[in-house]
Amino acid sequence: GTIETTGNISAKKGGSVILQCHLSSTMAQVTQVNWEQHDHSLLAIRNAELGWHIYPAFKDRVAPGPGLGLTLQSLTMNDTGEYFCTYHTYPDGTYRGRIFLEVLESSVAEHSARFQIP
């Protein structure tokens, strides 16, 4: 199996960004997807049986979706860093993807708006 991610992305301070991973090249069934921040704190979990769980510390700024992705809102400079998606699958086990997010001051971000949500 292979995890495809949005890779290195940048977004404007105060804006929003979508973190997206996609698992391909496997017959495995996805049972859960975990989203983690650079300091290994869990942002959210999407479980096949239980649905979405957004961790309390991020409830105000994290929205589930689209799909198995995650939307980060009201971005601050402290949000810069690595984000990881972990796909738990049966029977293959786990697959992990990495995304690097750089939050830019508004003036710089005009040149890097590719993954930004208007």
Epitope: M27, Q29, V30, T31, Q32, V33, R46, N47, A48, E49, L50, G51, G67, L68, Y90, P91, D92
Partner: antibody
Framework: EVKLEESGGGLVQPGGSMKLSCVAS????????MDWVRQSPEKGLEWVAE??????????NYGESVKGRFTISRDDSKSSVYLQMNNLRAEDSGIYYC????????????WGQGTTLTVSS | QIVLTQSPAIMSASPGEKVNLTCSAS???????LYWYQQKPGSSPKLWIY???TLASGVPARFSGSGSGTSYSLTISNMEAEDAASYFC?????????FGGGTKLEMK
């Protein structure tokens, strides 16, 4: 207690249509991937179709002999899976089983008792 | 599609005898995706072994499974009367998923 109950089988003429239903209970249906498997003396056990969970985009897949004729669907709110069968042929006859599979640290695999479809004029 | 060939098609074994059923695949099957089912007349198939070697809940320890690639087997260390049934291998390593033709195991 886990239960899968199929219904909708019967006698149908070649070229006709039939819809099979399967109602599940005793496990978390929304987390299960569901299949239809059929069995006949001529062909043995034959996988027909599957529908995966929402996390897996409710992806559907079909056996070669039923592609374009059969459609699998599910309604998680009713813990049910369906198989719409169109343009039926004699070789579609057999016992149709509903199968549910679930992994939550342990793997579970459940089958219904089956419903019989006879395609004949 | 992957064709699963089971042998023998029919066999009989005495109580206490060691039994080996084989499943040969026309192309490689990932071991996590190879299952065995037991079926008795008038009943639906029951999961017996999954992921090549893991016994399903309630399956006696005299059963075991092994194999890799294109060759898999189910072994009963000492045959008992309740083991008389048909056994089917099944793969979901690639589409379309397929079943073997089965081995009917009878008690001598």
């Amino acid at each position: 207690e886990v239960k899968l109950e199929e219904s909708g089988g019967g006698l149908v003429q070649p070229g006709g249509s039939m819809k099979l239903s399967c109602v599940a209970s005793g496990f978390t249906f929304s987390g299960a991937w569901m299949d239809w498997v059929r069995q006949s003396p001529e062909k043995g056990l034959e996988w027909v179709a599957e529908i995966r969970t929402k996390v897996n985009n409710h992806a559907t897949n079909y056996g070669e002999s039923v592609k374009g004729r059969f459609t699998i669907s599910r309604d998680d709110s009713k813990s049910s899976v369906y198989l719409q069968m169109n343009n039926l042929r004699a070789e579609d006859s057999g016992i149709y089983y509903c199968r549910g599979a679930l992994y939550d640290g342990f793997y579970f695999d459940y089958w219904g008792q089956g419903t019989t479809l006879t395609v004949s004029s | 599609q992957i064709v699963l060939t089971q042998s023998p098609a029919i066999m009989s074994a005495s109580p206490g005898e060691k039994v080996n059923l084989t499943c040969s695949a026309s192309s490689s099957v990932s071991s996590g995706y190879l299952y065995w089912y037991q079926q008795k007349p008038g009943s639906s198939p029951k999961l017996w072994i999954y992921g090549t070697s893991t016994l399903a809940s309630g399956v006696p320890a005299r059963f075991s499974g092994s194999g890799s690639g294109t060759s898999y087997s189910l072994t009963i260390s000492n045959m008992e009367a309740e083991d008389a049934a048909s056994y089917f291998c099944h793969q979901w390593s690639s589409f379309p998923y397929t079943f073997g033709g089965g081995t009917k195991l009878e008690m001598k």
